[in-house]
């Protein structure tokens, strides 16, 4: 979110001034060219300036850094490593900066980094060690608490023949560095599936946003370990039904709120357990808005208003009785 200080408290660095002093080592509190700085708010904004590199002369006081709407393309290893280090940097927003590659160790030497937003960048090449910084089987814990990765999927012709889900999950799990992560947003990424291991290895999660993906099933996903989970956003996916195992796991989470709107629920005999559960549970937010999409005769029926007699499956006839 934006800093609370008024715009007038931001100082701007004139490009001619920056070039005039660029030969000397940077002054500790100067403001980079094309950026606005507020020492009072500990905030630097370099927004919509078509920057092609991360500024080298960021002030040491920076706590909130906005580098949105640029042309950064690549975050190399140690992209924010400075001498002295940016020890206060806690929130880093890189959304919409046309990043397509984040290399191993890109966020190293940021000991206080708690919030990172990489949304709206077409990440064709996200290193498995982007967040862990090392290829050790167990890395030093990352300080990250919030990781926002909404709409980072590149266009289909730019995915380089790799599983996009697999690439993202590899970065989340490498070195077990993100054990302290509390918020993970992965909305709008065309995910077809959620790899089985990912949630088990992020035990501190409080908020998980998987909305606006293409998830068809949660059958192989386990929420059992996520005992702290408070919100699970599954709106706008391709879910057809939630099966008993998933329902029981969700019901067993003590603080959970689940959001299920706008999924194409199939209201046949396989839906009976979910309807029964919905009628009893308090964990689903807006459960009265959930409606059937299929079969045609059930379209737009409210799930909570269905009874077992409504939920039938067409019998599968033996081949000898099938008609052409």
């Amino acid at each position: 979110s934006s800093p609370t200080s008024s715009a007038s408290s931001f100082s701007s660095s004139a490009p001619f001034l920056a070039s005039a002093v660029s030969a000397q080592p940077p002054l500790p509190d100067q403001c980079p060219a094309l950026c606005e700085c507020s020492e009072a708010a500990r905030t630097v904004k370099c927004v919509n300036r078509n920057l092609t590199e991360v500024p080298t002369d960021l002030p040491a006081y920076v706590r909130n850094l906005f580098l949105t709407g640029n042309q950064l393309a690549v975050l190399p290893a140690g992209a924010f490593a400075r001498r002295p280090p940016l020890a206060e940097l806690a929130a880093l927003n890189l959304s919409g900066s046309r990043l397509d590659e984040v290399r191993a160790g890109a966020f190293e030497h940021l000991p206080s980094l708690r919030q990172l937003d990489l949304s709206h960048n077409p990440l064709a090449d996200l290193s498995p060690f982007a967040f862990s910084g090392s290829n050790a089987s167990v890395s030093a814990p990352s300080p990250l608490v919030e990781l926002i990765l909404n709409h980072i999927v590149p266009p289909e012709d730019e995915r380089q023949n790799r599983s996009f889900e697999g690439m993202v999950v590899a970065a989340l799990l490498a070195g077990r560095a993100l054990q302290g992560l509390r918020r993970l947003e992965l909305a709008s990424n065309h995910f077809l599936y959620l790899p089985r291991d990912v949630l088990a290895q992020l035990p501190s999660l409080r908020h998980l946003d998987l909305s606006n993906n293409s998830l068809v099933s949660l059958t192989y996903v386990s929420f059992r370990n996520l005992t702290h989970l408070e919100s699970l956003h599954l709106e706008d996916n391709a879910l057809k039904v939630l099966h008993n195992g998933t329902l029981a796991e969700l019901q067993g989470l003590p603080h959970i709120r689940v959001f299920l709107d706008n999924n194409p629920w199939v209201c046949d005999c396989h839906m009976a357990d979910m309807v029964t559960w919905l009628k009893e549970t308090e964990v689903v937010q807006g459960k009265d808005r959930l409606t059937c999409a299929y079969p045609e005769k059930m379209r737009n029926r409210v799930l909570l208003e269905l009874n077992s007699a409504d939920l039938d499956c067409d019998p599968i006839l033996p081949p000898s009785l099938q008609t052409s």
Partner: nanobody, 122 residues
Framework: QVQLVESGGGLVQPGGSLRLSCAAS????????LAWFRQTPGTEREFVAA????????RYADSVKGRFTISRDSAKNTVYLQMNSLKPEDTAVYYC???????????????WGQGTQVTVSS
């Protein structure tokens, strides 16, 4: 090895337009950036523009911003340079370059084409 073949150069009047093309072939799997540089006799190669092959980022030299547009067709591994409002000082040999990094320095690029001559003159 990577091969880069430029085309589209020629003679044009001041204020006119040209479109250069550069087709990359060979072992292009490690290429992340395609760029255009230009050179006049007795000078070093000057950065003009660059684009990411698998992304959307672009960058331009200040001298061409607003006049030149770089674009690409990833499926064909081809990069284009649309040059409008051409000036006599744009006269040079234009080279296509390919590399992994995101840089305006010629030293960052491992692969170079043979160049195509652009002459802006009345």
């Amino acid at each position: 090895q990577v091969q880069l073949v430029e085309s589209g150069g020629g003679l044009v009047q001041p204020g006119g337009s040209l479109r250069l093309s550069c087709a990359a072939s060979g072992h292009t799997f490690d290429i992340k950036t395609l760029a255009w540089f230009r050179q006049t006799p007795g000078t070093e190669r000057e950065f003009v523009a660059a684009i990411r092959l698998w992304g959307t980022a672009t960058r331009y030299a200040d001298s061409v911003k607003g006049r030149f547009t770089i674009s690409r067709d990833s499926a064909k591994n081809t990069v284009y340079l649309q040059m409008n409002s051409l000036k006599p000082e744009d006269t040079a040999v234009y080279y296509c370059a390919a590399g992994r990094d995101w840089s305006a320095f010629s030293s960052a690029y491992d692969h170079w084409g043979q160049g195509t001559q652009v002459t802006v003159s009345s």
